[in-house]
């Protein structure tokens, strides 16, 4: 057993150009933490599988408000380190995801809304019980500053904090066969349990009589590099210098899976299938448990009261991804009907009706002309969720009550002069026009541009066609 | 403004089963996840469960072998079910919207009483 | 299952004085994930306060929820006589989803 602890020393813009925006603003101030999750091995997986090595999450850090003009500078941290137990053997090569949360904290409705800055990631070789790793990694525009270690729980010591300690028995000397505990040199090594002859720097064991191998070793005593060269038979071929296996006991041998697994061979060594809430390499984790507090957003973390039960996030509608943390444009949905615009306010979906449409999603098309009378003997048209009157001759205006005044848009062509009439419009035309609205030119030579006109008229007589 | 009825029969006999449907107005129900609460005469809340549109349900593990919940769009209603009920079961049943920033409860329906007796 | 404590169970005041509630957690809620609840007799409750600390609309600024962890504190600043009531929290942070057993606000 022991701790993985990660020290963050900045956040802020990388070097180069295109420096990013500040995250936070005086009108929407905000704070930082930070989420680490480690796997163990150099397999790469995807972000959303489980921490099988285990996950912290940070404190917030203070509170910063961006100086209106000023460049993006490294942001204010949480105090302290993240820290996270492992329970059994530190596999001494791991995956890590560190991701930086912003916790927004303006006056936005439904209070702190939090959003992912950055994600970084890595693989990396790490014996536990040695000094601070430093470390630098870039997402995208910012740049990441941070330190790491593994150590032993006491009494566990050794690179995979497999090694037991105890203390001295006598006060000179340790047991017969029994070494020093460096670098606890007033404990001794508790008496050996494994199998005999079982790497004390590869293999490890839970209970006594057997041998479990680290990453990266197998065969019954963990002596036997894993080779990653080709090899010709299923096992590789007897000869030592090629570096491949050598005929032998299998990497399931002795079944390697913890806590109920199946062991399965691989072409470079061995696979565990792990019973539900366990994982890692030899299924010797459990998972994150909803007391961890894994679901952003408010989020709402369903399962996973123990170890032995995974969790699952059941996210707030505009919120998804195995932890809430990811935003929803749920408007892109286009959940708003008959063409209503979609407002997105974060804590509901507003829909704006067109006219002539209600409802929550503009889904009712109301009927335009119930309870709508046009005036007048003018007629209601239905048509585009407005309604329309039709009026009668002589009336206007939206539901016809208002009385027309025929002239007022100036119907007569070339001057002509017009008169209101009980049923329209007359056109007295200048000279030289006829038609019912002075449209028509008459020709010098008295003929007209239209056939002749009515009987008992004379070109340039008011025309009334009704 | 969004308003939640609860309707069912007020009076239901041991080892039979409690039915309430509530009905949203003025709302979608394809927005939200809509949850039961119940309170017994004189005594605090108790959250029975919830569904989503999508068809995901949650129950208190203390209900769930004899509880079922489910969601009509068409209607714009969302519904209970509790067999074998016992006098244990009377109470004070509310229908509520869960609220968007997190699982707590926003509108509530006025509530109906379901007494559980022969 | 999280269980929510409140205490005390009942609060005898006068109008204009000041409200304290407390509610306490038998676990961490994670995320502030804890809302506040006033039920008056015969009526629905209302929600005042989520994420501990945040007003729901249209709830008067005399209500103020603070705590984190376990531990989180309703406060009334000055009663109004319309403020007496039975008060709720409840954490959802983890399902399943609890509510505390409540605190009467009654006249002194």
């Known amino acids: 057993a022991g701790v993985f602890e990660l020290q963050i020393h900045s956040f802020g813009p990388g070097p180069g150009p295109g420096a990013p925006r500040s995250p936070c603003s005086a009108r929407l101030p905000c704070r930082l933490f930070f989420r680490v999750c480690l796997k163990p091995g150099l397999s790469e997986e995807a972000a959303e599988s489980p921490c099988a090595l285990g996950a912290a999450l940070s404190a917030r850090g203070p509170v910063y408000t961006e100086q209106p003009g000023a460049p993006a500078p490294d942001l204010p941290l949480p105090d302290g380190l993240l820290q996270v137990p492992f329970r059994d053997a530190w596999p001494g090569t791991f995956s890590f995801i560190i991701e930086t949360w912003r916790e927004e904290l303006g006056d936005q409705i439904g209070g702190p809304a939090w959003s992912l800055l950055a994600r970084v990631a890595g693989r990396r070789r790490l014996a536990a019980g040695g000094p601070w790793a430093r470390d630098i990694q870039r997402a995208g525009a910012w740049e990441l500053r941070f330190s790491y270690r593994a150590r032993c729980e006491p009494p566990a010591v050794g690179t995979a904090c497999t090694r037991l300690c105890r203390p001295r028995s006598a006060p000179s000397r340790c047991g017969p066969g029994l070494r020093p505990c460096a670098p606890l040199e007033d404990e001794c090594e508790a008496p050996l349990v494994c199998r005999a002859g079982c790497s004390p720097e590869h293999g490890f064991c839970e209970q006594p009589g057997e041998c479990r191998c680290l990453e990266g070793w197998t065969g019954p005593l963990c002596t036997v590099p894993v080779s990653t060269s080709s090899c010709l038979s299923p096992r590789g071929p007897s000869s030592a210098t090629t570096g491949c296996l050598v005929p032998g006991p299998g990497p399931c041998d002795g079944n390697p899976c913890a806590n109920g697994g199946s062991c399965s061979e691989t072409p470079r060594s061995f696979e565990c299938t792990c019973p539900r809430g366990f994982y890692g390499l030899r299924c010797e984790v459990s998972g994150v448990t909803c007391a961890d507090g894994p679901c952003f957003n408010g989020g709402l973390c369903v399962g996973g009261a123990d170890p032995d039960s995974a969790y699952i996030c059941h996210c707030p509608p505009g919120f998804q991804g195995s932890n809430c943390e990811k935003r929803v444009d749920r408007c892109s949905l286009q959940p708003c009907r008959n063409g209503g615009l979609c407002l997105d306010l974060g804590h509901a979906l507003r829909c704006r009706c067109r006219a002539g449409f209600a409802g929550p999603r503009c889904e009712h098309d109301l009927d335009d002309c119930a309870g709508r009378a046009c005036a007048n003997g003018g007629t209601c048209v239905e048509g585009g969720g407005a309604h329309r009157c039709s009026c009668a001759l002589g009336f206007g205006g939206r539901d016809c009550r208002e009385r027309a005044d025929p002239c007022a848009a100036r119907p007569c062509a070339h001057g002509g002069r017009c008169y209101a009439h009980f049923s329209g419009l007359v056109c007295a035309c200048a000279p030289g026009y006829m038609g019912a609205r002075c449209e028509f030119p008459v020709h010098p030579d008295g003929a007209s541009a239209l056939p002749a006109a009515p009987p008992g008229l004379r070109p340039g007589d008011p025309q009334r066609y009704l | 403004q969004v308003q939640l009825q609860e309707s069912g029969p007020g009076l239901v006999k041991p080892s039979e089963t409690l039915s309430l449907t509530c009905t949203v107005s003025?709302?979608?129900?394809?927005?939200?996840?809509w949850s039961w609460i119940r309170q017994p005469p004189g005594k605090g809340l108790e959250w029975i469960g919830y569904?989503?549109?999508?068809?995901?349900?949650n129950h208190n593990p203390s209900l769930k072998s004899r509880l079922t919940i489910s969601l009509d769009k068409a209607k714009n209603q969302f519904s209970l079910r509790l067999s074998s009920v016992t006098a244990a079961d009377t109470a004070v049943y509310y229908c509520a919207r869960v609220f968007n920033w997190g699982f707590a409860f926003d509108i509530w329906g006025q509530g109906t009483m379901v007494t559980v007796s022969s | 299952e999280i269980v929510l404590t409140q205490s005390p169970g009942t609060l005898s005041l006068s109008p204009g004085e000041r409200a304290t509630l407390s509610c306490r957690a038998s676990?961490?809620?994670?995320?502030?994930?804890l809302a506040w609840y006033q039920q008056k007799p015969g009526q629905a409750p209302r929600l005042l306060i989520y994420?501990?600390?945040s007003r729901a609309t249209g709830i008067p600024d005399r209500f103020t929820g603070s705590g984190s962890g376990t531990d989180f504190t309703l406060t009334i600043s000055r009663l109004e006589p319309e403020d007496f009531a039975v008060y709720y929290c409840q954490q959802y942070g983890t399902s399943p989803l609890t509510f505390g057993g409540g605190t009467k606000v009654e006249i002194n």
């Open positions: 994420g501990a600390s």
């Open positions: 003025d709302d979608s129900i394809s927005n939200y996840y």
């Open positions: 569904i989503f549109y999508s068809g995901t349900t």
């Open positions: 676990q961490r809620i994670s995320r502030t994930y």
